[in-house]
Interface confidence: low
């Protein structure tokens, strides 16, 4: 009775179970009676990352500099190349197929988390007592100036976009 299933790391050919090729190698010839499967190493620039019966290796991913990508880790015969974004950019999706500029936090919002190669800037509204008057991918909210500690008085209240304005103490009349 012909076989319909094989052990792990084997595959079925003409009712015969052949050993698969290991990661980093591709199939050249199926096994035949007493002759084992013939495999050959993937060429430079190619890979196979699983036990397989593939006739062709996969091309390594190309990290396209036009898209802001560069090689994070060179591929081997067993692993694909991994790409990451250039400084100042982050991936547009999980596969990191292209990159985009980090977002800026506008005035009134400060940077909660600085962007990385894989995640964008996270902004947070400045709470009472803090302000941000710039669009930035780096600046956190700054605390309002304390007029009192400078021996001054508050002339104008601060907002989430502006600092307090301090002025001199009014002179007391005799």
């Amino acid at each position: 009775e012909p076989r319909t299933a094989c052990r792990e790391k084997q595959y079925l050919v003409d009712s015969q179970c052949c050993n698969m090729c290991p990661p980093g190698e591709k199939l050249v010839n199926d096994c035949l009676h007493t002759i084992d499967t013939e495999c050959t190493r993937c060429q430079t620039g190619e890979f196979l990352d699983t036990w397989n019966a593939e006739r062709h290796c996969h091309q390594h991913k190309y990290c396209d500099p036009n898209l802001g990508l560069h090689v994070e880790k060179e591929g081997t015969s067993e692993t694909d190349t991994t790409c990451t974004c250039d400084e100042g950019l982050h991936c547009t999706n999980a596969a990191c197929e292209s990159c985009t500029m980090h977002s800026l936090c506008p005035p009134g919002l400060g940077v909660k988390q600085i962007a990385t190669g894989i995640s964008d800037t996270i902004c947070d509204p400045c709470p009472i007592g803090f302000f941000s008057n710039v669009s930035s991918a780096l600046e956190k909210c700054h605390p309002w100036t304390s007029c009192e500690t400078k021996g001054l008085v508050k002339v104008q209240a601060g907002t989430n976009k502006t600092d307090v304005i301090c002025g001199p103490q009014p002179r007391l009349r005799a």
Epitope: N66, G68, L89
Partner: antibody, heavy 120, light 107 residues
């Protein structure tokens, strides 16, 4: 307009170190790479490395790792390269140049160069 | 490291002639090549980026072509002010590398 203004020429003793500055103006300093390039007298251009002032991250040509140290001060929009343990091989003109964060964009603005002469 | 080979080392032409500079990469780099002009005692100046993209403010007589491993910078009508060294540079992978340069002389 975009400008990169480098510090003046330096005459330094062998074994000493030198710190060259590159002051940027006319653009957002934290959003572009600053690259450093070396040119020995009568020779071609050699890439030393880059710094991204927005993060402080650096990338060095292995040939210059331990020889050059790249830093940046965002408050003054100035990038620096310090070249240490100077020998006659370090006598050269050092250029800073700006590059967009997209990988394939070139070094579009260059400083005027700083001449370093190593001599006793 | 990617090796960039420029040829010839010296080019000598008459004003008005068309001239071509060659840059060959040791491996395929797509269009990640840029061309610079450096006059005597001056800083490099960007002429062409990404193999063929023109740069604002650079005369239209400068053009670039090529992809993969073979690249060319052309000046379609040489002027005396074009006397300079010309360098190609790749930004496909680190370390960035420059070609050895070609010196343009006027006959």
């Amino acid at each position: 307009q975009v400008q990169l203004q480098q510090s003046g020429p330096e005459l330094v003793q062998p074994g000493a170190s030198v710190k060259i500055s590159c002051r940027a103006s006319g653009y957002s300093f934290t959003s572009y790479y600053i690259h450093w390039v070396k040119q020995r007298p009568g020779q071609g251009l050699e890439w030393i490395g880059w710094i991204f002032p927005g993060s402080g991250n650096t990338k060095y040509n292995e040939k210059f790792r331990g020889k050059a140290t790249l830093t940046a001060d965002t408050s003054s929009s100035t990038a620096y390269t310090q070249v240490s343990s100077l020998t006659s091989e370090d006598s050269a003109v050092y250029f800073c140049a700006r590059k967009s964060p997209y990988g394939n964009y070139a070094m579009d603005y260059w400083g005027q160069g700083t001449s370093v002469t190593v001599s006793s | 490291d990617i090796l960039l080979t420029q040829s010839p080392a010296i080019l000598s032409v008459s004003p008005g002639e068309r001239v071509s500079f060659s840059c060959r990469a040791s491996q395929s780099i797509g269009t990640s090549i840029h061309w610079y002009q450096q006059r005597t005692n001056g800083s490099p100046r960007l002429l062409i980026k990404s193999a063929s993209e023109s740069i604002s403010g650079i005369p239209s007589r400068f053009s670039g072509s090529g992809s993969g491993t073979d690249f060319t910078l052309s000046i379609n009508s040489v002027e005396s002010e074009d006397i300079a060294d010309y360098y190609c540079q790749q930004s496909n992978s680190w370390p960035y590398t420059f070609g050895g340069g070609t010196k343009l002389e006027i006959k």
